[in-house]
């Protein structure tokens, strides 16, 4: 399915947050291990009626630098964000499409690990690895290699490392021409591809109907984003849970910090800073406890990631047009109505009095004068026959009189203007309203 609406073009980007997973007790500061934003993906506009094409994703690897030793066990949060490119006031609008989290064990210098995580109707496939920046080496990046100029006891092509000079490491050389972005090797001379890429040198993007594959160069954190398949097919267990089929359905065995039928209840805590747009996070610091985001006005969603469409509540009354300006709501009122929510039915009498003793009356929200005897027109400024407006209802006869008009009512009607039928037409012993009318429906009389 498309992440963009037919009205507005959009583009995707990713946010990655890493935190050390060494200590179970202490709440780490948000993204203490590192955080990164990907580049924006290509602009995408949905074509109404057309099938969803390959989803354009941000280019290149997403690198999260970490300053200290690699902890081995870490927690991650990967968010897929949509940026709507319209003429919104205040610039582009961001909204969170998918958010996945997990805790993993990973040694630095090891091979690429592949992962599949589910978030609602989306599935995020990504590959990751931890790599030491020279001169650091080792599974925790704590050992330092000597500079190349230092005397070496290692043979040709091998590097000496401190503190144990007899440990010599062979630099891993992949197959010649293997894509540095989309390929990797665990053995010298091989070229293995990241999710979404194929070919002997991992330079050919995979394009399948079942997966909204990236176009052009891909991101290591984002192979593809696709609607999820059925039970145990592609692993319905989120957050690294393992799926086992049962006679009736399936069962997920969840890793520590996740629970629920599909391990969908996140082990993310307030320490990870999961609440966006100024939302207040409430919940325990313990990794197994849930959290709740209390959103500021104008935002909603479990992570305060969605801007509230305040116009959907139809705050403007009497047919007023609602405008959500972000910082405030505005109602553009129809003629004859006013007020912040168009709640006042104007008779416009304050600004435009009726002349010659006329009185202002409601006329569907517009100014209307009921004129005194002998006057007519919009503001009662014209001399007129008082009976010209047919002021007597139900066929009553109008007579101009020095003190005003008089209605002589037809038989069966009464009232100053003959507006009350003594026995309403069609109101026999049974119907609760005249024939053909439900109670509350209008009946027109000439």
């Amino acid at each position: 399915r498309s992440p963009c609406s037919a009205r507005l073009p959009c583009r995707l980007f990713f946010r990655v947050c890493l935190k050390p997973g060494l200590s179970e007790e202490a709440a780490e500061s948000p993204c203490a291990l590192g955080a990164a934003l990907s580049a924006r993906g290509p602009v995408y506009t949905e074509q109404p009626g057309a099938p969803a094409p390959d989803l354009p994703l941000p280019d290149g690897l997403l690198q999260v630098p970490f300053r200290d030793a690699w902890p081995g066990t870490f927690s991650f949060i990967i968010e897929t964000w949509r940026e709507e490119l319209g003429d919104q006031i205040g610039g582009p609008a961001w909204s969170l499409l998918a958010r996945v989290a997990g805790r993993r064990r990973l040694a630095a210098g090891g091979p690429w690990a592949r992962d599949i995580q589910r978030a609602g109707a989306w599935e995020l496939r990504f590959s990751y690895r931890a790599r030491c920046e020279p001169p650091a080496v080792g599974t925790a990046c704590t050992r330092l290699c000597r500079p190349r100029s230092a005397p070496s006891r290692c043979g040709p092509g091998l590097r000496p490392c401190a503190p144990l000079e007899d440990e010599c490491e062979a630099p891993l050389v992949c197959r010649a021409g293997c894509s540095p972005e989309h390929g990797f090797c665990e053995q010298p001379g091989e070229c293995r591809c990241l999710e979404g890429w194929t070919g002997p040198l991992c330079t050919v993007p995979v394009s399948t109907s079942s997966c909204l594959s990236p176009r052009g160069p891909s991101s290591a954190t984002t192979g593809c984003l696709v609607p999820g398949p059925g039970p145990c097919d592609g692993n319905p267990c989120a957050n690294g849970g393992s799926c086992s089929e049962t006679p009736r359905s399936f069962e997920c065995t969840c890793p520590r910090g996740f629970y629920g039928l599909r391990c969908e209840v996140s082990g993310v805590t307030c320490a990870d800073g999961p609440c966006f747009n100024g939302g207040l996070c409430v919940g325990g610091a313990d990794p197994d406890s849930a959290y709740i985001c209390h959103c500021p006005p104008g935002f909603q969603g479990s992570n305060c990631e969605k801007r509230v469409d305040r116009c959907s509540l139809q705050p403007c009354r009497n047919g007023g047009l609602c405008l959500d300006l972000g910082h405030a709501l505005r109602c553009r009122c129809r003629a004859g109505f006013a007020g912040p929510r168009c709640e006042h039915d104007l008779d416009d009498c304050a600004g435009r009095a009726c002349a010659n003793g006329g009185t202002c009356v409601e006329g569907g929200g517009a100014h209307r004068c009921s004129c005194a005897l002998g006057f007519g027109g919009r503001d009662c400024r014209e001399r007129a026959d008082p009976c010209a407006a047919r002021p007597c209802a139900h066929g009553g006869r109008c007579y101009a009189h020095f003190s005003g008009l008089v209605c002589a009512c037809a038989p069966g009607y009464m009232g100053a203007r003959c507006e009350f039928p003594v026995h309403p037409d069609g109101a026999s012993a049974l119907p609760a309203a005249p024939p053909g009318l439900r109670p509350g429906d209008p009946q027109r009389y000439l």
């Epitope: 039915d345 409601e362 006329g363 009232g415 209008p442 009389y445």
Partner: nanobody, 117 residues
Framework: QVQLQESGGGLVQPGGSLRLSCAAS????????MAWYRQAPGKKRELVAG???????NYVDSVKGRFTISRDNAKNTVYLQMNSLQPEDTAVYYC???????????WGQGTQVTVSS
Amino acid sequence: QVQLQESGGGLVQPGGSLRLSCAASGSSVSFLSMAWYRQAPGKKRELVAGISTDGSTNYVDSVKGRFTISRDNAKNTVYLQMNSLQPEDTAVYYCYAYRWVGRYTYWGQGTQVTVSS
């Protein structure tokens, strides 16, 4: 469109009192001619009392001196105060509105009034 909702009906003993209310929405009652009608079993619906836009009131002879029609523009409601109720006042009471703009009439759903010992 004008909507009318009656309330206040019920069972009362002869000589007792009731006050019926008719809440209007969709237009101000000050711009409507409003009335109360009633329909007893097996009989035609008949006018009980009416109040015109100018505030003048009309009553059928059988209720004069006992019933009073009034309106509260602030609450957009018309009332029928019924005193000295008799068994012959037993009926379904309907609220009625006549809107001069367009000359439409509107009816409420009705409320049952029963006078019995």
